[in-house]
Amino acid sequence: KSPIFGPQEVSSIEGDSVSITCYYPDTSVNRHTRKYWCRQGASGMCTTLISSNGYLSKEYSGRANLINFPENNTFVINIEQLTQDDTGSYKCGLGTSNRGLSFDVSLEVSQVPELPSDTHVYTKDIGRNVTIECPFKRENAPSKKSLCKKTNQSCELVIDSTEKVNPSYIGRAKLFMKGTDLTVFYVNISHLTHNDAGLYICQAGEGPSADKKNVDLQVLAPEPELLYKDLRSSVTFECDLGREVANEAKYLCRMNKETCDVIINTLGKRDPDFEGRILITPKDDNGRFSVLITGLRKEDAGHYQCGAHSSGLPQEGWPIQTWQLFVNEESTIPNRRSVVKGVTGGSVAIACPYNPKESSSLKYWCRWEGDGNGHCPVLVGTQAQVQEEYEGRLALFDQPGNGTYTVILNQLTTEDAGFYWCLTNGDSRWRTTIELQVAEATREPNLEVTPQNATAVLGETFTVSCHYPCKFYSQEKYWCKWSNKGCHILPSHDEGARQSSVSCDQSSQLVSMTLNPVSKEDEGWYWCGVKQGQTYGETTAIYIAVEERTRGSSHVNPTDANARAKVALEEEVVDSSISEKENKAIPNPGPFANEREIQNVGDQAQENRASGDAGSADGQSRSSSSKHHHHHH
């Protein structure tokens, strides 16, 4: 007997689709070897139609795929738009040739069956309504009209024109006529359930002259749409329930053995397992809405159902839509840390992955807000200016081509803790989720700027120094001028001979920035930071105020703002002085990607890590934690 297993017989009808799952023994070789689906000919030869190596035959082009699920030791062959020509004997198997381990599958595709002419078939989905048309002759116009449901022995009344209604149909069945037409009556049944399926007879009149019509009502559970998504990617459930439920509360639930557990609804309910990675978005007034889940996990796989009901909970006889979600562990999305840790006053550098094939896409960073239906307002983007409340402490560094961009947030406070999403206007599968945790600082920061009382005098020379510990000796140090379009890195040069790397004097590790002469445009936020190649580390921020030379002048001391702005990571010892006249920031990026756009984007997401030390256990110590203010002098 073959160790491969699958369905022995698959039967379907023309135009339909099949998903054939083949199961293989759990071995490393089996998981990685070629999977195939071939058709057996009369000669005994088996002609490959599709394989996991990427081969796809002409007759399957555009209508079939093969997906391997190594974590389940299964692979699935999906074939759509079936025709009777697809009827035949097939093999699903493993191995470099079609003579490897295999399982025989018989596929039979039939014509859509013709129905007897005297029976009218109504096919409806659960929760919808049906209007049954019952014609009659004029002579039966004054007679009683009725609809009954056939049981084994008799026909049980549903409703009649004398306003008798079966208890099971109270509030759901209506018998009516339209206008002046005296040759047809109608019965409408709403909130259809499985139990409503069956044969009905509508009748006008009594005895041999009565008009009768046979009706076959089929009530279908909606076909689950199959969704195949990668681990750490995202999925959007697009739910279209129709205008009749436009004003009802909407929900998404996941089926388990007995019930369907609500994951999110428009009444504010949300499953804690999906905290930080789910949004529900009403689309329009026609009952359409979507649910986006990012950062897909293996355990997210399952059977999902969306629906509408005033309670926000699944209710029998209300419209639903269903999906079967598969999460493939062979993911193209890099495995990043999903939790980044920082300390008050410190900073984090978050590496956001994006599809490397889309390096020119616009990059964004938004903060997930759980209130209401959930939303993710953009805080910064390559063409989105930094939101005002993040002035001086948030920047996005795009590193074209390497599949990563970095978001740096400094002067952290406990209020910054929460969930953030990295996303682009390109491949939506690469949307990723980060949880930022902020603890109270317990020690001095790694980077410290002096003087902290940073007020420069117009026309004079002003120098600020950034002190860093020996552990940053080998890393690149930089100063940048912050604007709401980014942090423009300033040119720097060595301030003389470097110290020997063998001895490192803690007191003399510094990188300096000199403004000479100071101009009014020099006023603003500056960051001192460390990085290693394209990996950004700690930063600290300082606000430099510029004032005119006046005798005995006094000004607001911005020390409180600057003390907060310290951060941490390791880097190289370069004592540089930075001389800079025109603090050019990155070019103006253009339109702002607003909150609604981000709410409505399609599919994908998850875990990221802080670069370098940012977020490691021994990583960061900060000073005070209160929010910074812009100082005007």
């Epitope: 379907s12 099949v18 998903s19 388990n256």
Partner: nanobody, 130 residues
Framework: EVQLVESGGGLVQTGGSLRLSCAAS????????MGWFRQAPGKEREFVAA??????????YVGDSVQGRFTISRDAAGNTVYLQMNSVKPEDTAVYYC?????????????????????WGKGTLVTVSS
């Protein structure tokens, strides 16, 4: 409450035939898959056959030990499943259990694994005499 009721078991001679039925009932229960397992005294529960459906498409699975002899089918409503047992052997003697699934998870879960079925009947005894 979901109920699965098996019927059709009994005594049959070697080489004979038997047809088992399993009816699923419950207020809103509409299964996506039903199957048969069997358990002989002192042995583990063994997969016999299963049927899964999705719209107009039906998938039938048969265990190695009964291939070519047993067939599985269902009624049009989808709430009753049948096991047609032909050319029975003494080793087919066992209690036959009906199983059902409400959630269409079979695409990724092996129907041969008893743990992955949600609902079970009480069983019907089939005895094959030689």
């Amino acid at each position: 409450e979901v109920q699965l009721v098996e019927s059709g078991g009994g005594l049959v001679q070697t080489g004979g035939s038997l047809r088992l039925s399993c009816a699923a009932s419950g207020r809103t229960f509409s299964p996506y898959a039903m199957g048969w397992f069997r358990q002989a005294p002192g042995k583990e529960r063994e997969f016999v056959a299963a049927i899964r459906w999705s719209g107009a498409t039906t998938y039938k699975y048969v265990g190695d030990s009964v291939q070519g002899r047993f067939t599985i089918s269902r009624d049009a409503a989808g709430n009753t499943v049948y096991l047609q047992m032909n050319s029975v052997k003494p080793e087919d003697t066992a209690v036959y259990y009906c199983a059902a699934d409400r959630v269409p998870k079979d695409i990724s879960i092996d129907p041969r694994n008893p743990k992955d079925w949600d609902y079970w009947g009480k069983g019907t005894l089939v005895t094959v005499s030689s």
